[in-house]
């Protein structure tokens, strides 16, 4: 025999009692498949945490983040602090990129400015807290009669750290 | 949705060489670092280093610097975890995870086995 | 770089409190984030920047830093909290984390 309890659509859950018929979600509940035996508590977009979708019987609530705060996590499940760019987050707040770093995002960690002499090249435009530094051609490529510049390309040595 | 997928099992023999990969999907893959983390057959995790894809730095734990390569191509997305030369005590699960404190997303993993 | 020195076991009678210890040097000037890890699958966070619960996690799980040790916190175990935990943290010193040894979490009876 076929549990009708399957017949219960979504927004509704199946009672325990013999008839089993199908019950309505209370408030802060939904149930978003069929047959379920219960309702799930709707997600509560609290703190750092707004409210992107409300909760319906059929559907859990969505969260996003306060302004100022990123999503992290699927269907955002955490919110990180925003920094501004050249700046990265530490336990004591958003703190300026050290010299010879930068961070182009809102958020993440500095990382050390390209070096364009690994490459062979010079800097064709100096780096900030923001922005990396443009790498140009070879000093030997700006000589009076060099011939061919090689586009810009970014080197660092593998596993270097800023100090 | 956000994906990390990981190449699958690999059995290699000592002295070989192996890149594994890991595709992100469902986000700016440029922009958010990634970590490769270790975990040894019935041991712990251990961190051995971060790429950030969109312009290839990478930092390296000082436990695995010299033993292996990270490095990506953003344009598919994908980063890599190399060795030019395996050992048996390279037999492990390597994960990638987003991220370079707070990991919020990982792969399935990929199990490498070196026996000869 | 920091070590983080975990207990490699801890037991726990049903509906009593769990608690994991995280040391390291100061670690209580950095984030501690913890993962919870169950067999065959990849470790999932269950708290971040030292006491912030991801939405999903259950409110049994908290989470303390200060000084040398950051603390896991899990009142009310249940027996499917019974899985490896791991501390970690991103040091700006070597700009690397690192792990703890992880503490395997079981539930008697």
């Known amino acids: 025999i076929q549990d009708s309890c399957s017949k219960c659509p979504a927004g509704t859950f199946c009672g325990k009692n013999k008839s089993q018929i199908c019950i309505p979600c209370p408030p802060n509940s939904f149930s978003s498949t069929s047959g379920q035996k219960a309702c799930d508590i709707c997600r509560q977009c609290e703190g750092v945490f707004r409210t992107k979708k409300v909760c319906s019987s059929t559907s859990n609530a969505e969260c996003d983040c306060i302004s100022g705060f990123h999503c992290l996590g699927a269907g955002c499940t955490m919110c990180e602090q925003d920094c501004k760019q050249g700046q990265e987050l530490t336990k004591k707040g958003c703190k300026d990129c050290c010299f010879g770093t930068f961070n182009d995002q809102k958020r993440g960690i500095c990382r050390p400015w390209t070096n364009c002499s690994l490459d062979g090249k010079s800097v064709l435009v100096n780096g900030t807290k923001e922005r990396d530094v443009v790498c140009g051609p070879s000093p030997a490529d700006l000589s009076p009669g060099a011939s061919s510049v090689t586009p810009p390309a970014p080197a660092r040595e593998p596993g270097h750290s800023p100090q | 949705q956000v994906q990390l997928v990981q190449s699958g099992a690999e059995v290699k023999k000592p002295g070989e060489s192996l890149k594994i990969s890991c595709k992100g999907s469902g986000y700016s893959f440029s922009t958010y670092w990634i970590s490769w983390v270790r975990q040894m057959p019935g041991k712990g995790l251990e961190w051995m280093g971060k790429i950030y894809p969109g312009d290839s730095y990478t930092n390296y734990s000082p436990s695995f610097q010299g033993q292996v390569t990270i490095s990506a191509d953003k344009s598919i997305s994908t980063a890599y975890l190399q060795w030019s030369s395996l050992k048996a005590s390279d037999t492990a699960m390597y994960y990638c995870?987003?991220?370079?404190?707070?990991?919020?997303?990982w792969g399935q993993g990929t199990l490498v086995t070196v026996s000869s | 770089d920091i070590e983080l020195t975990q207990p490699p076991s801890v037991s726990v009678a049903p509906g009593q409190t769990a608690r994991i210890s995280c040391s390291g040097d100061n670690i209580g000037d950095q984030y501690a984030h913890w993962y919870q890890q169950k067999p065959g699958q990849a470790p999932v966070v269950v708290i971040y920047q030292d006491k912030n619960r991801p939405s999903g996690i259950p409110e049994r799980f908290s989470g303390s830093n200060s000084g040398n040790t950051a603390t896991l916190t899990i009142s009310g175990t249940q027996a499917e909290d019974e899985a490896d935990y791991y501390c970690s943290t991103y040091t700006f010193v070597g700009f690397t984390t690192v792990f703890g040894g992880g503490t395997k979490l079981t539930v008697l009876g």
């Open positions: 995870a987003r991220g370079y404190g707070i990991f919020d997303y």
